[in-house]
């Protein structure tokens, strides 16, 4: 059947290749981290939804994006206990085929929805700050809501492969099932395509748009400050811009790098078992980093504004929202907000407190 040299070779390969990410500390550490993300995420994002919807009455374009961001996070967080159990049980899936598909789709959906929403938020900030007058007609509540519907549809489309190809798989002659991606011969290139799509559509393009938007905002504000040399410069704005871009980048870059390495392994470009083991081990850790930061996003963006902060702390003290609607103008914006009256090019006015939730 197999000659001795081949058998020796196989044994050597097996000795060189650890258990493909199946390490005991992973089965303890990852469920613990998932549990922390679940508790913090559910608490934080629920409060964000309450603050934006009930306290701030969902009046601005950016608040629509922020609300949807929190809702997308909540959808994902609800499936997190399933993944915690799955990892704690050493990648055994006891929840059946239907939940296998739903939970898998939820992970993919959240990635694309949140990244697309953050991208739209950055474009909205750019339009509000750099072109406040020109963009006034375009930046309406209707446009924001339609944009969110399109984002949810696109994210749904991106998570379809998980719904189609994720199925429970009985491991051999045991009653143990796993929630695995199934690929037939005719679609064996799909995992490579999915990995590269995640890299390009789920990170590279959005990051370039976010980077461009905030770079242009930076330049516009710098120009405005240069015009008003006698006014004190507010460096906080520039720190916030840096924080937004770096937070997004460092949240996702580990997961995206390991996703790309996994693609290279599947293509046979990387054939080193040690690297394969590192990728398999690191993948759930990078997921923890990405999704934990992702779930903090609504809080992070919200807390850039004084009003959001005030309502948030008010809610923590159980102070109910006022029954009457706020008197804000609909042109005022949430998260990185800009007052259209404070035109960036104006030399007589101070640059807007543009990173404020109104």
């Amino acid at each position: 059947i197999l000659n001795s040299s081949t058998e020796d070779g196989i044994k050597r390969i097996q000795d060189d290749c650890p258990k493909a990410g199946r390490h005991n500390y992973i089965f303890v550490m990852i469920p613990t981290l998932y549990s922390i993300i679940f508790v913090v995420g559910i608490f934080g994002n629920s409060l964000v939804v309450i603050v934006i919807y009930f306290y701030m009455k969902l009046k601005t374009v950016a608040s629509v994006f922020l609300l949807n961001l929190a809702l997308a996070d909540l959808c994902f967080l609800l499936t997190l206990p399933l993944w915690a159990v799955y990892t704690a049980m050493e990648y055994r899936w006891p929840f059946g085929n239907y939940l296998c598909k739903i939970a898998s789709a939820s992970v993919s959906f959240n990635l694309y929805a949140s990244v697309f929403l953050l991208t739209c938020l950055s474009i909205d900030r750019y339009l509000a700050i750099v072109h406040p007058m020109k963009s006034r007609l375009r930046r309406t509540m209707l446009v924001a809501k339609v944009t969110c519907i399109i984002i949810w549809l696109l994210a749904g489309l991106a998570s379809l492969p998980a719904i189609i190809h994720r199925n429970v798989f009985f491991i051999e002659n045991t009653n143990i099932t796993v929630c695995a991606f199934h690929y037939e011969s005719q679609n064996s290139t799909l995992p490579i395509g999915l990995g590269l799509t995640k890299n390009i559509l789920g990170f590279l393009f959005p990051f370039l748009i976010i980077l461009t938007s905030y770079t242009l905002i930076w330049k516009a504000l710098k120009k405005a400050y240069e015009i008003q040399k006698n006014k004190p410069r507010n460096d906080d704005i520039f720190k916030i811009i840096m924080a937004i871009v770096l937070f997004f980048f460092f949240s996702w870059i580990p997961h995206q790098i390991f996703t790309f390495l996994d693609v290279l392994i599947q293509l046979g470009i990387i054939r080193d078992c040690r690297i394969a083991d590192i990728v398999d081990t690191a993948m759930p850790i990078t997921i923890c980093i990405a999704y934990f930061n992702n779930c903090l996003n609504p809080l992070f963006y919200g807390f850039l504004g004084k009003k959001f902060k005030r309502y948030f702390l008010q809610l923590l003290k159980y102070i109910p929202p006022k029954a009457k609607s706020h008197s804000n103008l609909s042109t005022k914006m949430s998260t990185l907000s800009y007052r259209p009256s404070d035109n960036v090019s104006s030399s007589t006015k101070k640059p807007a407190p543009c990173f404020e939730v109104e």
């Epitope: 197999l2 196989i10 390969i13 290749c17 798989f169 695995a180 599947q266 046979g268 054939r271 993948m283």
Partner: nanobody, 118 residues
Framework: EVQLVESGGGLVQPGGSLRLSCAAS????????MGWYRQAPGKGREFVAA???????NYADSVKGRFTISRDNSKNTVYLQMNSLRAEDTAVYYC????????????WGQGTQVTVSS
């Protein structure tokens, strides 16, 4: 990418033998466990035999002692030697490559028909 191509199926008389081969193009790690599954008409896919990179094997109770699974990593090929075939072994035999970790994947071949009939 991983592609699995089965061969060796056909018509055989009860008590006869067949050897199925599964050639994997693309790169199959020793971390991928290779297995054979079968699907009889009107039934679900059921496990037949599996082999790890280190050549540890596992068999379904119904084929133990009759079927032997082996693997040649240098050729990226898995074999299923089927002896003392019975009518109930009639099915489409699928080759599978799978890894069970944080991102589990199962790759399936297109299947090869095995018919045991007199």
């Amino acid at each position: 990418e991983v592609q699995l191509v089965e061969s060796g199926g056909g018509l055989v008389q009860p008590g006869g033998s067949l050897r199925l081969s599964c050639a994997a193009s693309g790169y199959i790690y020793s971390r991928y466990r290779m297995g054979w599954y079968r699907q009889a008409p009107g039934k679900g896919r059921e496990f037949v035999a599996a082999i790890s990179g280190g050549s540890s094997t596992n068999y379904a109770d119904s084929v133990k002692g009759r079927f032997t699974i082996s693997r040649d990593n240098s050729k990226n090929t898995v074999y299923l030697q089927m002896n003392s075939l019975r009518a109930e072994d009639t099915a489409v035999y699928y080759c599978a490559a799978y890894k069970i970790d944080s991102n589990p994947r199962v790759y399936w071949g297109q299947g090869t028909q095995v018919t045991v009939s007199s």
